[in-house]
Interface confidence: low
């Protein structure tokens, strides 16, 4: 049996650095959608009521506890009547997969904030990206949330060659040895080694010595 007309399908969580959107199909014709998400008390909270979109931003809900495992469902109603129900007296609905933000949100592309050369050492600093997770009315950074679960891998190479070296850190800083008089290029990747899925971010944009971000000191 196929999906009943009006019933949502392909419910998918799209989440990066805790910005979290539930997407689904199909585009509605003559009906609207309402999303529900279960909170920590297992109550269903209404979101995106009566929408004709096929996505719903659930960030505000999931950042309340990023370690919690959330479920959502998409309810379908005939257009103009959010009280209409299916044959069993319930609106048509489809459940999402479970979603645990801490374990599953994608790591966004990191950014190299700066690099500074002192003699034959270079200190490379990764920007500590702000997330939408709040505590005491302030937004936490990625490091605040993940702590030592988050590492960064630095790829670096001489501008004149293609042979890459790597370094890892549990902070947002690298201190690496370089050859004096050589220019180097850098790219970083965020990694959460303890994860089974979504372990790595995409690589940051490449930054090279001799460009604006760097600073050189003898």
């Amino acid at each position: 049996a196929g999906t009943p007309p009006g019933k949502a399908f392909n419910l998918t969580w799209i989440s990066t650095d805790f910005k979290t959107i539930l997407e689904w199909q199909p585009k509605p014709t003559n009906y609207t959608y309402t999303v529900q998400i279960s909170d920590r008390s297992r109550n269903w909270k209404y979101k995106c009521t009566g929408t004709t979109d096929t996505e719903c931003d659930l960030t505000d809900e999931i950042v309340k506890d990023v370690n919690w495992t959330y479920e959502a469902r998409v309810l379908s109603y005939p257009a103009g009547n959010v009280e209409s129900t299916g044959s069993a007296g319930e609106p048509l609905y489809e459940n999402s997969p479970e979603f645990t933000p801490y374990l599953e949100t994608n790591l966004g592309q990191p950014t190299i904030q700066s690099f500074e050369q002192v003699g034959t050492k270079v200190n490379v600093t990764v920007e500590d990206e702000r997330t939408l997770v709040r505590r005491n009315n302030t937004f936490l950074s990625l490091r605040d949330v993940f702590g030592k679960d988050l590492i960064y891998t630095l790829y670096y190479w001489k501008s004149s060659s293609s042979g890459k070296k790597t370094a890892k850190t549990n902070t947002n800083e690298f201190l690496i040895d370089v050859d004096k008089g050589e220019n180097y290029c850098f790219s970083v990747q965020a990694v959460i080694p303890s994860r089974t899925v979504n372990r790595k971010s995409t690589d940051s944009p490449v930054e090279c010595m001799g460009q604006e971000k760097g600073e050189f000191r003898e």
Partner: antibody
Framework: QVQLQESGPGLVKPSQTLSLTCTVS?????????WSWIRQHPGKGLEWIGE???????RYNPSLKSRVTISVDTSKNQFSLKLSSVTAADTAVYYC??????????????????WGKGTTVTVSS | EIVLTQSPGTLSLSPGERATLSCRAS???????LAWYQQKPGQAPRLLIY???SRATGIPDRFSGSGSGTDFTLTISRLEPEDFAVYYC?????????FGGGTKVEIK
């Protein structure tokens, strides 16, 4: 100098919930460390229970996970342990400790450098 | 979980002698996450060594740590009377964090 002090009832009845609090003095609980609970059964070795980061992220020992909750109250500079459905096997000295990150030459090192004195909890009716 | 096996269980030595304590892991442990603690009766553990080989603040240089991978060693070059205690190794790299069973260094 950071100091830790455990507090809570020394006697808990079987099937009840053990509740302990660790108060951090001489420093901020939000300063980037993890905060752990460890226990030691009489005459035995040390067992790590779990830890919390000030942002609320937790890790638990899988052997205790179903019964353990660790929480943090940054306004009081405290973190707490709750262990439910206790039995005589939970009788132990309970320690809180600071799990410190130490950055050196491109790497991070972790170790528990500050411990509370420990509090003895007996489970008995 | 990573099981840390310490040997010997008890070491009987005299003051001035050298003590060598072993900690073997069931799987490889990053040395960044390997620490040694000393515990005396009625007291909390005290950090001696972190990162497998770095002495904690205030720890005398007669204590040294070494090793990598699965084999780690704590050495006390010349035992002082206050060194007689139980010593634990610990890994804080993989959950659950685990301690070895301890080695008791007692006066012969």
């Amino acid at each position: 100098q950071v100091q830790l002090q455990e507090s809570g009832p020394g006697l808990v009845k079987p099937s009840q919930t053990l509740s302990l609090t660790c108060t951090v003095s001489g420093g901020s609980i939000s300063s980037g460390q993890y905060w752990s609970w460890i226990r030691q059964h009489p005459g035995k070795g040390l067992e790590w229970i779990g830890e919390i980061y000030y942002s609320g992220s937790t890790r638990y020992n899988p052997s205790l996970k179903s019964r353990v909750t660790i929480s943090v109250d940054t306004s009081k500079n405290q973190f707490s342990l709750k262990l439910s459905s206790v039995t005589a096997a939970d009788t132990a000295v309970y320690y809180c400790a600071r799990d410190t990150p130490y950055y050196y030459d491109g790497g991070y090192y972790y170790y528990m450098d500050v411990w509370g004195k420990g509090t003895t909890v007996t489970v008995s009716s | 979980e990573i099981v840390l096996t310490q040997s010997p269980g008890t070491l009987s030595l005299s003051p001035g002698e050298r003590a060598t304590l072993s900690c073997r892991a069931s799987q490889s442990v990053s040395s960044s996450y390997l620490a040694w603690y000393q515990q005396k009766p009625g007291q909390a553990p005290r950090l001696l060594i972190y990162g497998a080989s770095s002495r904690a603040t205030g720890i005398p240089d007669r204590f040294s740590g070494s090793g990598s991978g699965t084999d780690f060693t704590l050495t006390i070059s010349r035992l002082e009377p206050e060194d007689f205690a139980v010593y634990y190794c610990q890994q804080v790299g993989v959950v659950p964090y685990t301690f070895g069973g301890g080695t008791k260094v007692e006066i012969k």
